[in-house]
């Protein structure tokens, strides 16, 4: 009763919301709510029933599965989604979903901060930029992996000759989508012209 | 907030008839069902009928039939009950009281504070 | 039409005291059936429905148990504010009908 299930998903794609297990058998209604208390649908063993809301017009109720599909969901969509049945025996049953939206993220910039040759090592400081975002950093020299503790949006790391790399590529994601930045210096310790 | 304010205290003729209103607010109206509940004085509840706001589908005591109606007005969220040819034993308190449900599941959530019917020649 | 008996049909009891109200139907209602509370000169109050289950907002000390025919409403440890007439009402068919009531009044 009321376990809750999480579901992330990318912003403007078609969600199915539905419960693992089968419905009880025979139920008498079924109702969907966002935020605890506004309806969405209502199943009443003749017909749904759409009511007023955000939702009118891109959901979709299944009576068979209780699944309720929604179009083209937004981030105003994040909420926590609750299934509710009432059974033949006059008992209700709920489950809950905690849908989140996340818009897919945008393309970073690197900005180079500073750049130095230092007795043969590169002293090198580089930051990586997205309008104000929840993602993570992942940095790669020529496509390898930086180490954990270097992984957040600014990079500052002072390279031996045997460690230089020519390009360097900050990788943000989120839990539904990721994208790339890539900045390449001349050897040893110069940005490449582009 | 969830609120249904029931219109004030009526006095009436035997044989007249009488319309008590509800007006919901704190919620989507068409979303659940109104019953309609009445309390004769020193007496227990009595259950008269159902309407849903969503498509006005109805159902009615049998002591009722014939003498009452059940409408709805979806523009200003408002259940109404009209009774006629009210005797004495019609005087009573009448609830609103909100189903769980659009379609009835007689399980009430919210009850309106009550108008009170007084029959009085 | 379903017919509900309640009993008592009033009860003495004092702050802090376990009190029990049970509730019959003339036929198997399985679990449908909902307790409301009433003060004078007031309105009904949800407090259970589907036998069991408490409608939001009420407190914990209030409960309600059984199935078919035979009902229970349980306060466990009486408040002051807990003094007033207690009804049960069957939900499983038209016509909803109620029992006659319970007070529960300060000894």
């Known amino acids: 009763q009321g376990h809750l299930v999480h579901m992330t998903v990318v912003s403007g794609s078609n969600v199915t919301l539905n419960i693992s297990e089968s419905l009880p058998e025979n139920y008498k209604q079924l109702t969907w709510f966002y935020t605890f208390d506004q309806k969405i649908v209502e199943w009443d063993s003749r017909k749904s029933k759409y009511f007023e809301s955000k939702f009118k017009g891109r959901v979709r109720l299944d009576p068979q599965s209780g699944a309720l599909y929604i179009s083209k969901v937004q981030k105003e969509d994040n909420s926590t989604y609750i299934m509710r049945v009432l059974k033949k025996t006059g008992n209700e049953q709920e489950w809950k979903i905690k849908l989140q939206v996340l818009d897919p993220v945008p393309k970073p910039v690197i900005k180079i901060e500073k750049i130095e040759d230092m007795d043969d090592n590169c002293y090198l400081k580089l930051s990586c930029v997205i309008p104000g975002e929840s993602v993570n950093y992942t940095w790669y020299g020529d496509k390898r992996p930086f180490p954990k503790e270097l992984q957040n949006s600014v990079l500052e790391t002072t390279l031996m000759p045997h460690n230089y790399s020519r390009c360097y590529t900050c990788q943000v994601s989120n839990s539904v989508s990721s994208k790339n930045g890539t900045v390449c210096l001349s050897p040893p310790c110069t940005l490449a012209r582009s | 907030e969830v609120q249904l304010v029931e219109s004030g205290a009526e006095v009436k003729k035997p044989g007249a008839a009488v319309k008590v209103s509800c007006k919901a607010s704190?919620?989507?109206?068409?979303?659940?069902?109104i019953s309609w509940v009445r309390q004769a004085p020193g007496q227990g509840l009595e259950w008269m009928g159902w309407i849903s706001a969503y498509d006005g589908d109805t159902n009615n005591a049998q002591k009722f039939q014939g003498r009452v109606t059940m409408t709805t007005d979806t523009s200003s969220s408002t259940a109404y009950m009209e009774l006629r040819s009210l005797g004495s034993d019609d005087t009573a308190v009448y609830y609103c009281?909100?189903?769980?449900?659009?379609?009835?599941?007689?399980?009430?959530?919210?009850w309106g504070q009550g108008t009170l019917v007084t029959v009085s020649s | 039409d379903i017919v509900m008996t309640q009993s008592p049909s009033s009860v003495s009891a004092s702050v802090g005291d376990r009190v029990t109200i049970t509730c019959r139907a003339s036929q198997d209602i399985s679990s449908w059936l909902a307790w409301s509370q009433q003060k004078p000169g007031k309105a009904p109050k949800a407090l259970i429905y589907?036998?069991?289950s408490l409608q939001s907002g009420v407190p914990s000390r209030f409960s309600g148990s059984g199935s078919g025919t035979d009902f229970t409403l349980t306060i466990s440890s009486l408040q002051p504010e807990d003094f007033a007439t207690y009804y049960c009402q069957q939900a499983n068919s038209f016509p909803y009908t109620f029992g006659q009531g319970t007070k529960v009044e300060i000894k």
């Open positions: 009281a909100r189903d769980r449900y659009s379609s009835s599941s007689g399980y009430f959530d919210y």
């Open positions: 704190g919620y989507t109206f068409t979303a659940y069902g």
């Open positions: 589907a036998a069991s």
